[in-house]
């Protein structure tokens, strides 16, 4: 048995090695040799009792959503969509898979996490990694230069996810983007306003939005002595500062990425700073940084951004953080990331971030990558990390032991005596036709107690009870499940009464 387990482990390791070599675009001969080894290892495993051993589960990094989880998810989506619509966004959708070529070269070091689909004879396809690159492709393909849109859909990443922290291989993104040539920083400020509105509405706790600018980062790297070719890889090291210490980041930059220690120290002097508009002012006076054209542009824009954020009333939620260096290659200007704050144990301690819940930035060059003439369409946008938000909301509701309704049924059509199935069917149909959310139990002669119990469990507020006497009198007994109070309602007034009691508008508009 141990031998089989060892062999299974080797098959897994060899499979990972083959995938890694393919992603690194290793030589065809090396890939061929390693694939041959994988096949030999698999052959030694033999046919296996896999039929009996098959474990019924969802693939790694995925999950099912129960009705309870879906109810939470729909509430979260509702808050987000209402906000997007309030800001005048249209909605689009794009295919779940794109041509591999569309996604190539857009994600830098993260490209290794793209899911490639098996060749189906013809097109080389990959599952979308985010909603931004497909949006840029959509703009270029349709020659659009101006749109404000939102898009809510699943994306796919071959990550090693910590699912307990709301990280998955298949997950939803909720994106809002503004494309077009506008005056500086107005759309950027609106994106940050939207982010703050959504996070406040969701009531998931205190949050902070870190803001930086790609041009400031690039300018800073240049004056510190980082070669152009190392910019992106050093960015990805700096971006880890929210998770690990400066010492660890420095070790990675020097040890793994070949940066000179004195260059790393110069970077350290900058990236460990964070603050508000005063830090922007301070850096505008920095003798070295202010001499760099890119950095100067970035700082000028951030100063303007802070003015608008103050007017929007959200400047207290924003922190200028020089260590923010979001990993995606396509950002060109302002970048931002919202983190939830854990309440510190001791007063006077710095608030502690517990992971990104929203992020975004300006990407003015992405659409141009798809345009044959390289025509640029400036874009800025944000993405809400809903999976993490779902996890937080679910945990909060569990802690409060709050009951969540998983249906919206307003009334159960019940009967007090036998042989009234036909009458129940007629009444439930009348209610459906009038736009009432109604149910009945699928039994000919259900016990009244069972029907009332069903309402308790499902959280259905009303029961419309049919009895022989009621039929004769042309009334229906309407019972409130919580108060147990019953009233006779004339059949022709029932729809109006249910709507009145459940706060539903009287006409279906």
């Amino acid at each position: 048995m141990a031998e089989r387990a060892a062999l299974e482990e080797l098959v897994k390791l060899q499979g990972e090695r083959v995938r890694g070599l393919k992603q690194q675009k290793a030589s065809a001969e090396l890939i061929e040799e390693e694939v041959a080894k994988l096949l030999k290892l698999k052959a030694q495993l033999g046919p296996d009792e896999s039929k009996q051993k098959f474990v019924l589960k969802t693939p790694k990094g995925t999950r099912d959503y129960s009705p309870r989880q879906m109810a939470v998810r729909e509430k979260v989506f509702d808050v987000i969509i209402r906000c997007f619509k309030r800001h005048g966004a249209e909605v689009i959708d794009t295919p779940v898979f794109e041509l591999k070529e569309t996604l190539m070269g857009k994600y830098g070091e993260d490209s290794k996490l793209i899911y490639d689909l098996k060749d189906q004879g013809g097109e080389l396809l990959s599952l979308r990694y985010d909603l931004t690159v497909p949006f840029a492709r959509y703009l270029a393909m349709n020659k659009l230069t101006n749109i404000k849109r939102y898009h809510i859909a699943k994306v796919y990443r071959r990550d090693n996810p910590a699912m307990t922290r709301g990280r998955y291989r298949e997950f939803y993104q909720c994106d809002f983007d503004i494309a077009g040539n506008f005056d500086p920083m107005i759309p950027d400020a609106e994106c940050l306003k939207i982010m703050c509105e959504i996070l406040s509405s969701l009531q998931i706790g205190d949050f902070l939005v870190k803001v930086n600018d790609r041009r400031i980062l690039d300018g800073m790297f240049a004056i510190c002595g980082v070669s152009d070719s190392k910019f992106r890889t050093i960015c990805s090291s700096v971006d880890k500062l929210d998770k690990v210490s400066w010492e660890e980041v420095k070790n990675e930059m020097v040890g793994e990425k070949g940066l000179a220690p004195e260059v790393a120290d110069r970077i350290g002097d900058y990236v460990q700073q964070h603050g508000g508009v005063s830090l922007v002012e301070q850096l505008l006076q920095d003798p070295k940084l202010s001499q760099n054209k890119q950095a100067l542009e970035g700082l000028g824009d951030l100063k303007l951004l802070f003015e608008y954020l103050t007017l929007f009333g959200i400047d207290d939620k924003i922190s200028f953080d020089l260590s923010l260096a979001r990993g995606l290659d396509y950002y060109t200007g302002v970048i931002y990331e919202a983190v939830l704050l854990q309440t510190p144990a001791q007063a006077g301690e710095e608030p502690l971030g517990v992971g990104s819940v929203a992020a975004g930035g300006r990407y003015d060059g992405l659409v141009g990558m798809f345009d044959p003439k390289g025509r640029k369409v400036p874009c800025v946008g944000l993405s809400i990390g809903v999976e993490r938000i779902f996890s937080i909301v679910e945990q909060r509701l569990e802690a409060l032991e709050e009951k969540i309704r998983t249906t919206e049924t307003q009334v159960l059509v019940a009967s007090a005596q036998k042989k009234l199935l036909e009458e129940r069917l007629k009444l439930v149909s009348e209610l459906w036709d009038a736009g009432i959310k109604a149910e009945l139990l699928y039994k000919k002669n259900p016990k009244l107690l069972n029907q009332l119990q069903y309402c308790e469990e499902a959280g259905i507020p009303l029961v419309a009870i049919i009895g022989e006497q009621e039929l004769k009198d042309g009334v229906i007994k309407l019972r409130s499940v919580t108060s147990r109070e019953e009233v006779d309602v004339r059949r022709e007034d029932l729809v109006e009464e249910i709507k009145r009691r459940t706060g539903q508008p009287l006409c279906i508009c």
Partner: antibody, heavy 120, light 107 residues
């Protein structure tokens, strides 16, 4: 009995040649990648070269590339290492070994070793 | 090439002791690591492969752990026959390289 037995070692002058052999028994030789690993006196181990069961794949450490040639004869259950242009630094005990689970570059069965001394 | 660094280079211990030897790779090697035991004048003997899988016939007092760049070999209770030199080896990419060895001596 599952075993590997090396032969062919000896004293040779710098620039000279030598052919090492490794006789395998007790397992299906053609299924396995085979390798030569050496150990200089009092020193650590160095992976010299390997060959796949089907002869299709071979590789050499940079220190021996162009001078050593690995080969095998599956009919005779034998592995060979042809060593040309020998240098002082090639002095070592040469072990032949078999890959674990046929294709994993870890030696699960080793010969007793044969000493090659390169000296004028 | 991937460098393998073992520590300590030698260790003195007594029968019954628990001993741990560490091996570090200069870059990530997933779980492609083996441990060998070698006695003077003998060929190395495979103890552990794939970082933690015990080779058949090897006593269960030997165990391996780790992945990425940091690995350990542990002997839970030293026996007289365990005094030898121990080598780690990476099998991630060619040229496959060995650590410089750890000599385990009787205290």
């Amino acid at each position: 009995q599952v075993q590997l037995v090396e032969s062919g070692g000896g004293l040779v002058k710098p620039g000279g040649s030598l052919r090492l052999s490794c006789a395998a028994s007790g397992f299906t030789f053609s299924d396995y990648y085979m390798t030569w690993i050496r150990q200089a006196p009092g020193k650590g181990l160095e992976w010299v070269s390997y060959i796949s069961g089907s002869f299709r794949y071979t590789n050499y450490a940079d220190s021996v590339k162009g001078r050593f040639t690995i080969s095998r004869d599956n009919a005779k259950n034998s592995l060979y290492l042809q060593m040309n242009s020998l240098r002082d630094e090639d002095t070592a005990v040469y072990f032949c070994a078999r890959y674990v689970y046929q294709v994993v570059a870890i030696g699960d069965l080793w010969g007793q070793g044969t000493l090659v001394t390169v000296s004028s | 090439d991937i460098q393998m660094t073992q520590s300590p280079s030698s260790v003195s211990a007594s029968v019954g002791d628990r001993v741990t030897i560490t091996c570090r790779a200069s870059q990530g090697i997933s779980s492609w690591l083996a441990w060998y035991q070698q006695k003077p004048g003998r060929a190395p003997k495979l103890l552990i492969f794939a970082a933690s899988s015990l080779q058949s016939g090897v006593p269960s007092r030997f165990s391996g752990s780790g992945s990425g760049t940091h690995f350990t070999l542990t002997i839970s209770s030293l026996q007289p026959e365990d005094f030898a030199t121990y080598y780690c080896q990476q099998a991630e990419s060619f040229p496959y390289t060995f650590g410089q060895g750890t000599k385990l001596e009787i205290k």
